[in-house]
């Protein structure tokens, strides 16, 4: 008789999840020699231990502590790029600007990027059928708690000028409910961080509006200022040109506004 299985509203664990995490870990240590002390088998065991046999709505940050410890990594604290709802461009940017880092450029972010995972209470099985949805089921699910944990740690590590890329095409350019708005903003350390600089990325070719004047950006400025951190904002009118100019800063067309 097939065992009754909890049906969640979200997609199930990504196929080949264990193999993918292990392979990503090995790849990461191959291309980042400074992380070759990491034992990828131990990393996978710690990752698995955070959610296997646990109710997928009762996951805590504490569950991920063994993994956090194994994945401890020092990135230059003044070279951090946060992003909200514009991941691809942020990653294209750090791919060119090699001395800057998004969360997904760190080992733990790289391991979990775009993956879904969950287990079941009291069984060692991974649930490939469905996993809890943050809105429809519960917020303390394995994926959400993981990203909350690593995002908090990443923001806490930041110093000097922290950059954030925001999507100017969205109705809420700054969204208080995003990971950036709900976790990272509140975990920047005022004693270490001098300025948060927002880059608002324009979507339309002919969009010449100053999106730094958007009400949600003013809301972000207010939150940041109350935390004794300075705020600045830049419009990136042409993201394609922006990337091109990061690649070739000496190009004559790169002195004008982008």
């Amino acid at each position: 008789v097939p065992r009754w299985r909890q049906q969640w509203s979200g997609p199930g664990t990504t196929k080949r999840f264990p193999e993918t995490v292990l392979a990503r870990c090995v790849k990461y240590t191959e291309i980042h020699p400074e992380m070759r002390h990491v034992d990828c088998q131990s990393v996978w065991d710690a990752f698995k231990g955070a959610f296997i046999s646990k109710h997928p709505c009762n996951i805590t940050e504490e569950d991920y502590q063994p993994l956090m410890k194994l994945g401890t990594q020092t990135v230059p604290c003044n070279k951090i790029l946060l992003w909200s709802r514009i991941k691809d461009l942020a990653h294209q940017f750090t791919q060119v600007q090699r001395d800057m880092f998004t969360l997904e450029d760190t080992l733990l972010g790289y391991l979990a990027d775009d993956l879904t995972w969950c287990g079941e209470f009291n069984t060692s099985k991974i649930n490939y059928q469905s996993c809890p949805d943050w809105r429809k089921d519960c917020s303390n699910n394995p994926v959400s708690v993981f990203w909350k944990t690593v995002s908090r740690r990443f923001a806490e590590a930041a110093c000097d000028v922290v950059h954030v890329m925001l999507n100017g095409s969205r109705s809420k350019i700054f969204d208080k409910n995003s990971t950036f708005g709900s976790v990272e903003v509140h975990n920047l350390q005022p004693e270490k961080v001098q300025t948060l600089e927002a880059w608002v990325i324009h979507g339309g070719r002919e969009d010449s509006r100053d999106l730094c004047q958007d009400p949600t950006i003013k809301e972000l400025e207010s939150i940041i200022s109350k935390r004794n951190i300075q705020f600045s904002c830049k419009n990136i009118y042409r993201p394609d040109k922006f990337l091109q100019c990061v690649k070739n800063p000496e190009d004559s067309s790169c002195t004008s506004e982008i």
Epitope: R16, K27, I31, R36
Partner: antibody, heavy 123, light 112 residues
């Protein structure tokens, strides 16, 4: 069985661009970094760059920066290496290569190589 | 970049006799994980290189036990206990401690 099969020899004129392919089989393409290595005639081996086929991220040797582009097509399990503004010194055999994994650790040595693609640059 | 220097550049050997190739790196290749990121390859005439040794002294799969690697942080040796005719080709050392990975100039082993 792991196999890396490269495209055939090419003859190009100076200033042209060449694009070499490396089709893999016997393993999950996205699970491994792919490297490219140049060997000029009578010369040694020179690393050119890598690609992570899963993410498309790359890194290139300074010597080739700006002229080399490594890409990957996960739908066909194929990596590509494109070299532009060709000059006579680019006449060489080009290899794709991959490490082995020994009990969940990258060996750090290229255990699998393509058969090589000879590119001749001549006017 | 780490510079790899091999010697000799040419090595004529009688079959059945031992052979030894040296390789020096401009920096230590010992990682904090305890592994030394030094590899040895053999490129037989008309073929792609093949991995012989990784982590300074670990033989790659299928490599005969007459091949052995040893060394310290910057000085390395590849030894062939009894050279066979099939061992002819160019031997390269390579560091993979950091990027870019760099190779030695190669040592051509030929049969006397």
């Amino acid at each position: 069985e792991v196999q890396l099969v490269q495209s055939g020899a090419e003859v190009k004129k100076p200033g042209a661009t060449v694009k070499i392919s490396c089709k893999v089989s016997g393993y999950t393409f996205t699970d491994y970094i792919m490297h490219w290595v140049q060997q000029a005639p009578g010369k040694g081996l020179e690393w050119m760059g890598w690609i992570d086929p899963e993410y498309g991220s790359t890194d290139y040797a300074e010597k080739f920066q700006g002229r080399v582009t490594i890409t990957a097509d996960t739908s066909t399990d194929t990596a590509y290496m494109e070299l532009s503004s060709l000059r006579s010194e680019d006449t060489a055999v080009y290899y794709c290569a991959r490490v082995a994994i020994i009990t969940t650790v990258a060996s750090g040595g290229f255990a699998y190589w393509g058969q090589g693609t000879l590119v001749t640059v001549s006017s | 970049d780490i510079v790899m220097t091999q010697s000799p550049l040419s090595l004529p050997v009688t079959p059945g006799e031992p052979a030894s190739i040296s390789c020096q790196s401009s920096e230590s290749l010992l990682h904090s994980n305890g592994k030394t990121y030094l590899n040895w390859y053999l490129q037989k005439p008309g073929q792609s290189p093949q991995l012989l040794i990784y982590w300074m002294s670990t033989r790659a799969a299928g490599v005969p036990d007459r091949f052995s690697g040893s060394g310290s942080g910057t000085d390395f040796t590849l030894k062939i206990s009894r050279v066979e005719a099939e061992d002819v080709g160019v031997y390269y050392c390579q560091q993979f401690l950091e990027y870019p990975p760099t190779f030695g100039q190669g040592t051509k082993l030929e049969i006397k």
